[in-house]
Amino acid sequence: KLTIESTPFNVAEGKEVLLLVHNLPQHLFGYSWYKGERVDGNRQIIGYVIGTQQATPGPAYSGREIIYPNASLLIQNIIQNDTGFYTLHVIKSDLVNEEATGQFRVYPELPKPSISSNNSKPVEDKDAVAFTCEPETQDATYLWWVNNQSLPVSPRLQLSNGNRTLTLFNVTRNDTASYKCETQNPVSARRSDSVILNVLYGPDAPTISPLNTSYRSGENLNLSCHAASNPPAQYSWFVNGTFQQSTQELFIPNITVNNSGSYTCQAHNSDTGLNRTTVTTITVYAEPPKPFITSNNSNPVEDEDAVALTCEPEIQNTTYLWWVNNQSLPVSPRLQLSNDNRTLTLLSVTRNDVGPYECGIQNELSVDHSDPVILNVLYGPDDPTISPSYTYYRPGVNLSLSCHAASNPPAQYSWLIDGNIQQHTQELFISNITEKNSGLYTCQANNSASGHSRTTVKTITVSAELPKPSISSNNSKPVEDKDAVAFTCEPEAQNTTYLWWVNGQSLPVSPRLQLSNGNRTLTLFNVTRNDARAYVCGIQNSVSANRSDPVTLDVLYGPDTPIISPPDSSYLSGANLNLSCHSASNPSPQYSWRINGIPQQHTQVLFIAKITPNNNGTYACFVSNLATGRNNSIVKSITVSASGTSPGLSAGA
């Protein structure tokens, strides 16, 4: 089918476009291009007759069009008015015509945009800022970049005016960033220079450092104050309400107990007109105090929360020590100490992290211990366990099921039968059961603190008849002299005897055979190839008995030492050498040959026609079993004598 492809489809003003013709028929009289979606003589651009190679301009010819012998049309110096459809009218030499229509779109090359702003110094949490991308351009898409990333999703960011305007409501200091706008159309993309938003903020509540509030008599007190602020804050210090100095740092050498008191830092921002203060209480001790532990989370959730234990008070030039379970800290990637050892962080706590924890402060003479702290780790519930494990019951007995799931605080339990809620207890008791009590018994454990729930479902069958049992195996393809196999007779049923047969016979006495789990499990230690037999289990009670289908054990073994046949080692020149290698193996091994150490072919049989003395040497057969991962080999020496030199030589096969 005749088709037109525009290359490119989106064309920049001033550039050129090629209307490329595909599947042009052979044997043509000529063709003509028209502007629009139909053949209209008034809108003919150019006609072309194949035979004469004559191009005839039409009414819509602009002088910018070039027609090619393959009917493709090149339009140069594209203008906006060229946008639209173009129709090719092809006349074949038998005067049958075909038409095809193509199209392209024309877009202007975009200028470099710039950003205008309605507020050059907005105040945090008060002002809004509107950025506008200039100039306004038709058919252009506007994009915005913050720190060279696309706009984050935020209710405070709003695009309007066809995305040309970006408004930041209630600006914050985090909006201090590099903003760029970009204009795009299908033929060009231009980015503005960046505009940095200068948000006035603060001061925030000042931070006084260092954080420690306990000092020893005779030390120097050096407090520094900092408050996040733009422009930077001006600072003042007050001690017990009395102004001291207008500096960021307060220094008092050789302090005494009399320097204890409240120390206030005031931060002031002259542009926002705001003041903020922070007070710290400094205690100067003659002796170090008894330490104590504070925790940032008294009820952490297992595998979710981290807990930071801090040894108080903070005292300069002091060594902090920690103990867990009356032992020094174990090495663990989940235990982290701060640089000054004052804070112990337990990452992703587990139920085993309860403690107790103690911290200590070392002074010149002794170590002062804190009282122990125990963590209350919330965990679980784990998957509930329903006991007993029987799944088959006889009618008339009592059904008593108990559910347990490890959980802190202890789990709340619910029982469901076939999806219907029964009771909110840990135990479920049903007396004198019948076949109607068969069904799906679900125990649901819920931890109210963590909000987590876990369920376990157990199928209970009440039947006088025992079901046909089946054998499950922990290893379907054991390797000889290496693996053990445990067969288990399913299902587990109450008041039931379990029996086993091997190849239709009762179990032989062997130290490698062991029954366990009430004879329900048969374990074969160090399996051998002779254990590849049919195993059947049976269950019986006073009412009925049943046997499983046999399970044949597929023991992987070998390869054994191979045998090369025939056994002959001397041959006459001119005979055929036909060596066959065999090794007992499951699965069958892969064979390969080497002659004098040189690899030959990967076949079981090695055949060499008309051997000569040049074929003397060592012939090695290598066998490998990919399943057992074992290899074996054998070497045979072959001697080839010239014909008639020695009696008793094999003539070969």
């Epitope: 000529g30 003509s32 035979g51 004469t52 005839t56 038998d94 005067l95 049958v96």
Partner: antibody, heavy 117, light 108 residues
Framework: EVQLLESGGGLVQPGGSLRLSCAAS????????MSWVRQAPGKGLEWVSA????????YYADSVKGRFTISRDNSKNTLYLQMNSLRAEDTAVYYC??????????WGQGTLVTVSS | DIQMTQSPSSLSASVGDRVTITCRAS??????LNWYQQKPGKAPKLLIY???SLQSGVPSRFSGSGSGTDFTLTISSLQPEDFATYYC??????????FGQGTKLEIK
């Protein structure tokens, strides 16, 4: 032997209509494109219209476009030219001709159309 | 459109004469030019196609030559039945066929 026989010419008033026919024989009609060419009295030849073998493609000279319609009935081996809104300058002998690529290789004897009040 | 100009527009010659008629195209049309003969009161008849190929049944005294813009029709030995009007024609677009104005060959 290829034969083309035109009919349907005559006297018609300006604005009137006329239908010309061309019966073809001696060749597989549906395999060839056909054309009409006219010759005003004492003047040269002027191509009027053409049609492909199946009838699916038609072509007209600018002077008759919108007024004349070319058609064919391949089952009757006949070519037609329906002429409407006739003018005095349409007066001419109208020939039907068989088209082979780039040439008109066989022509009919022509039929005279006179447009006069 | 390409213009076809025949010369001369009329010509007198005698039986046995060698006659040449010229057709000139306003632009090159390569070798795609055809010649027709029309006798008074008769339909035109194709003589030469593709500038130099003789149509089946046309006497060999007629020949055509030329390529590009200049073409000639030659009658090597004029016969009585050759007195007629001769038209050149080329394939074109949007008019599929463009004819020359004709050359009338008369008896001297």
């Amino acid at each position: 032997e290829v034969q083309l026989l035109e009919s349907g010419g005559g006297l018609v008033q300006p604005g009137g209509s006329l239908r010309l026919s061309c019966a073809a024989s001696g060749f597989t009609f549906s395999s060839y494109a056909m054309s009409w060419v006219r010759q005003a009295p004492g003047k040269g030849l002027e191509w009027v219209s053409a049609i492909s073998g199946s009838g699916g493609s038609t072509y007209y000279a600018d002077s008759v476009k919108g007024r004349f319609t070319i058609s064919r009935d391949n089952s009757k081996n006949t070519l037609y030219l329906q002429m409407n809104s006739l003018r005095a300058e349409d007066t001419a002998v109208y020939y039907c001709a068989r088209y082979s690529p780039y040439v008109l290789d066989y022509w009919g004897q022509g039929t005279l159309v006179t447009v006069s009040s | 459109d390409i213009q076809m100009t025949q010369s001369p527009s009329s010509l007198s010659a005698s039986v046995g004469d060698r006659v040449t008629i010229t057709c000139r195209a306003s632009q090159s049309i390569r070798g795609y030019l055809n010649w027709y003969q029309q006798k008074p009161g008769k339909a035109p008849k194709l003589l030469i196609y593709a500038a130099s190929s003789l149509q089946s049944g046309v006497p060999s005294r007629f020949s055509g030559s030329g390529s590009g813009t200049d073409f000639t029709l030659t009658i090597s030995s004029l016969q009585p039945e050759d007195f007629a009007t001769y038209y050149c024609q080329q394939p074109s677009y949007p008019s599929l066929f463009t004819f020359g104005q004709g050359t009338k060959l008369e008896i001297k």
